[in-house]
C-alpha cells in the first residue's frame, strides 16, 4: 500500500525545549518518490504563517527519508513559537502540523524559579523539564 503522495512527518503537538545561545536544527522529515518537492518553513503569527525567506536552510538525504532543516545559529529568545513546513508538489500544497519551540533564555534559566513559583505556575515545570526526543535517524 505504498503511496507516492508527499508526506511531512511532523506530529501534532510536537515540541522542542531549547536554550537561547545554542545552535539548533529544526527538521521537517519529507517522504517523496521521484522529484523532490519545494519545501519552505514559516512561523505562526496568530492564524497566519509568515514565510521565513532569509533563513539558512539545508537538505539532508537519507535512504528512505529526507530532512528539510531550518538552522538556528544560535537560537535567540524571539525564536520561541510555532513553526510549520510546507511542500509544493505538482501544484499541490501540503502543510505539516505545527511544531513548537520553547526557548529558555540562558540568563533567566540560571535564575531558577523557586518552589513557590513552580507550585503557582505548573507550566514552568512542563517547559523546563518536558524535553521531547529529537527524531532518531
Amino acid at each position: 500500500k505504498e503511496s507516492c503522495d508527499v508526506q511531512l512527518y511532523i506530529k501534532r503537538q510536537s515540541e522542542h525545549s531549547i536554550l537561547a545561545g545554542d545552535p539548533f536544527e529544526l527538521e521537517c522529515p519529507v517522504k517523496y518518490c521521484a522529484n523532490r518537492p519545494h519545501v519552505t518553513w514559516c512561523k505562526l503569527n496568530g492564524t497566519t504563517c509568515v514565510k521565513l525567506e532569509d533563513r539558512q536552510t539545508s537538505w539532508k538525504e537519507e535512504k528512505n527519508i529526507s530532512f528539510f532543516i531550518l538552522h538556528f545559529e544560535p537560537v535567540l529568545p524571539n525564536d520561541n513559537g510555532s513553526y510549520r513546513c510546507s511542500a509544493n508538489f505538482q501544484s499541490n500544497l501540503i502543510e505539516s502540523h505545527s511544531t513548537t519551540l520553547y526557548v529558555t533564555d540562558v540568563k533567566s534559566a540560571s535564575e531558577r524559579p523557586s518552589k513557590d513559583e513552580m507550585a503557582s505556575r505548573p507550566w514552568l515545570l512542563y517547559r523546563h523539564h518536558h524535553h521531547h526526543h529529537h527524531h532518531h535517524h
Partner: antibody, heavy 121, light 112 residues
Framework: QITLKESGPTLVKPTQTLTLTCTFS??????????VSWIRQPPGKALEWLAH???????RFNPSLKSRLTITKDTSKNQVVLTMTNMDPVDTATYYC?????????????WGQGTLVTVSS | DVVMTQSPLSLPVTLGQPASISCKST???????????LNWLQQRPGQSPRSLIY???KLDSGVPDRFSGSGSGTDFTLKISRVEAEDVGVYYC?????????FGQGTKVEIK
C-alpha cells in the same frame, strides 16, 4: 502483509495491573509515519482510544486514563506493551492494538483480533 | 473531548438498495494543515474493526467502491450504493483531528 496480535491475561482482579503485549509483523516501528495504538471495546459498547506510540517513541494518551497508562515499544522484538494500573470491573473490555498509518496524521488501517479482559474478584 | 454522534443507531436495509449513515462532531474536524481527519470503520459480527475510509473520502485498500464517504467541518456521511450480505455489521466514524481521538457510538446495519 501487516498483522497484529494481542496477548495477556484474560482475567484480572480489581486493583491489579494489566499488562498487554501487541506483537506485530509486516512493518517496522522505527519507520517514519508508523505507530501503534491501543483501543478498547466494552461488551456491546463503542470503541475507546487509549494510547498511541509513534515511530520516534513519542507517546499520546487519552487524558481520562493517562494517570493509569504506560505504553512502550521494543522495535527489535516488534512489540508494543500497554500497562494499565488499578483495574476496575468497568475496565472489562476487548482490548485491540491497531497499526497507525500516516497520511498527514495517523489512521488505523490494520487491527489485531483483540483480547477479552475481564476484571472480577 | 470531541463527541461523535452517529445516526441512525440501527439501519435495516434491503439487499441491493442504498444505505446512508450520518456522523456529526461537536467541533470542526478541519485541521490547521488543511486536512480533515474523519475516518470510518466496519466491524462485522464477531470480528475486529476494519478500516474503510480515511480523510473523509479516501477508500482504504481492498475496500469495494460501493462504499463512499463525504462531508466537511462537522457533518459527514458514509454511503453504500448497493448493500450486499457481507456489509452487515457495525459502522463507526472516528476523528483524528483533536486529541483524544474519539469514536462514534456505532450504527448497526442489518438486512431486513
Amino acid at each position: 502483509q501487516i498483522t497484529l496480535k494481542e496477548s495477556g491475561p484474560t482475567l484480572v482482579k480489581p486493583t491489579q495491573t494489566l499488562t498487554l503485549t501487541c506483537t506485530f509483523s509486516g512493518f517496522s516501528l522505527s519507520t517514519f509515519g508508523m505507530g501503534v495504538s491501543w483501543i478498547r471495546q466494552p461488551p456491546g459498547k463503542a470503541l475507546e482510544w487509549l494510547a498511541h506510540i509513534y515511530w520516534d517513541d513519542d507517546k499520546r494518551f487519552n487524558p481520562s486514563l493517562k494517570s493509569r497508562l504506560t505504553i512502550t515499544k521494543d522495535t527489535s522484538k516488534n512489540q508494543v506493551v500497554l500497562t494499565m494500573t488499578n483495574m476496575d470491573p468497568v475496565d472489562t473490555a476487548t482490548y485491540y492494538c491497531a497499526h497507525g498509518n500516516w497520511d498527514g496524521e495517523t489512521y488505523f488501517d490494520y487491527w489485531g483480533q483483540g483480547t477479552l479482559v475481564t476484571v472480577s474478584s | 473531548d470531541v463527541v461523535m454522534t452517529q445516526s441512525p443507531l440501527s439501519l435495516p436495509v434491503t439487499l441491493g438498495q442504498p444505505a446512508s449513515i450520518s456522523c456529526k462532531s461537536t467541533q470542526s474536524l478541519l485541521d490547521s494543515d488543511g486536512k480533515t481527519y474523519l475516518n470510518w470503520l466496519q466491524q462485522r459480527p464477531g470480528q475486529s474493526p476494519r478500516s474503510l475510509i480515511y480523510l473523509v473520502s479516501k477508500l482504504d485498500s481492498g475496500v469495494p467502491d460501493r462504499f463512499s464517504g463525504s462531508g466537511s467541518g462537522t457533518d459527514f456521511t458514509l454511503k453504500i450504493s448497493r448493500v450486499e450480505a457481507e456489509d452487515v455489521g457495525v459502522y463507526y466514524c472516528w476523528q483524528g483531528t483533536h486529541f483524544p481521538w474519539t469514536f462514534g457510538q456505532g450504527t448497526k446495519v442489518e438486512i431486513k
